[in-house]
Amino acid sequence: IPTEIPASALVKETLALLSTHRTLLIANETLRIPVPVHKNHQLCTEEIFQGIGTLESQTVQGGTVERLFKNLSLIKKYIGGQKKKCGEERRRVNQFLDYLQEFLGVMNTEWIIESH
Amino acid sequence: IPTEIPASALVKETLALLSTHRTLLIANETLRIPVPVHKNHQLCTEEIFQGIGTLESQTVQGGTVERLFKNLSLIKKYIGGQKKKCGEERRRVNQFLDYLQEFLGVMNTEWIIESH
């Protein structure tokens, strides 16, 4: 993420641009893009960005719609950076278990787990 | 995920087993495991389960500690299933944009984005 714009501001601006250009983006009635069937979005970042690439190649560019896709590419870069940080530091078992407990706790309270 | 136990119950039981066996698991003082340096856990599932694999190979098995690792492998399978569902259905651009907006909205409100 560039030092020029914090990630949080980038996400906010991108949401606004997405709203602005929605009509232009949905112009292609025949295009089909893979859409995840659950709401655990972070698991699907690869597919989301592949979809954005498909959409970008189908969209008439210029002006702020170009900025929308540029922002999305910066968000992709940010997430790539976060993924790199997943395995960067080796720590004691104690600290790993804290993280695992936290992960399962989040899964328990925040994940959308469909009932079987 | 087996039909015998819902994923939510599995996660709850695993949290309890993790608490029970903590002392046994941290017995190896020299072992170092990669621990993510941020709290966007879903981005790091691969690294988390690699860490669990490392821990299991270093832990004396038997009794309910075996059940803990069995549960964790079922959770890994469940997450794998969720990841498969990321690109299963091709839908209209409209629906893709809804998902993208939702993803960015979640990023905006729930992600821990470090300030620069």
């Epitope: 993420i1 560039p2 030092t3 020029e4 960005f49 954005i52 690439g53 970008e56 190649s57 189908q58 969209t59 008439v60 560019q61 210029g62 170009e66 896709f69 540029k70 999305l72 590419s73 910066l74 992709k76 870069k77 | -």
Partner: antibody, heavy 120, light 107 residues
Framework: QVKLLQSGAALVKPGDSVKMSCKAS????????IHWVKQSHGKSLEWIGY????????NYNENFKRKATLTADKSSSTAYLEFSRVTSEDSAIYYC?????????????WGPGTMVTVSS | DIQMTQSPASLSASLGETVSIECLAS??????VAWYQQKSGRSPQLLVY???RLQDGVPSRFSGSGSGTRYFFKISGMQPEDEADYFC?????????FGSGTKLEIK
Amino acid sequence: QVKLLQSGAALVKPGDSVKMSCKASGYTFTDYIIHWVKQSHGKSLEWIGYFNPNSGGSNYNENFKRKATLTADKSSSTAYLEFSRVTSEDSAIYYCGRRIAWDHWYFDFWGPGTMVTVSS
Amino acid sequence: DIQMTQSPASLSASLGETVSIECLASEGISNDVAWYQQKSGRSPQLLVYAASRLQDGVPSRFSGSGSGTRYFFKISGMQPEDEADYFCQQGYKTPLTFGSGTKLEIK
């Protein structure tokens, strides 16, 4: 393998128009955006603009907006650059290039270039 | 428009020597930089993109680094076939802009 084949050298009179082509092969033409770049003799590179063969959209460098027109023909996998009302300033080599990916605005493949000479 | 100031304009190096070229952007460009090699009478060839990613098939003696507004391109161990012009390009914003080039010759 990926290839971009450009039309041959052109000698043009001042005030005339010139149209050059860039034929793509070895990949799906509509999957990649084609950019055009100008290189004046012994000088650096100047971006003219791009054409999206899929959407038909284009974007121009302000400096070339009134001079260049970018088009493409999907059926023959060919992109075109047309220069109008040429002057001696337009004498240069013109390259087409393929953008590497939606989130990387660089060119992984270039055509061999078309040399344009403006002379009466 | 983003200006890309490239230096030096020309450079001569002995075989095996390490060579470095710098590009300074007029604003932060978030690592959106590519480096191209252009041999005499040929079209440019992509060597490095996204500041430090090596394009497929490019020898590992070529590398890129930098962040913010300052970016560097390095050849670790000059070879005879490296004699060429080198250009940087920013891909952060349109209009896309290039550096003025560095002519690299063998001493």
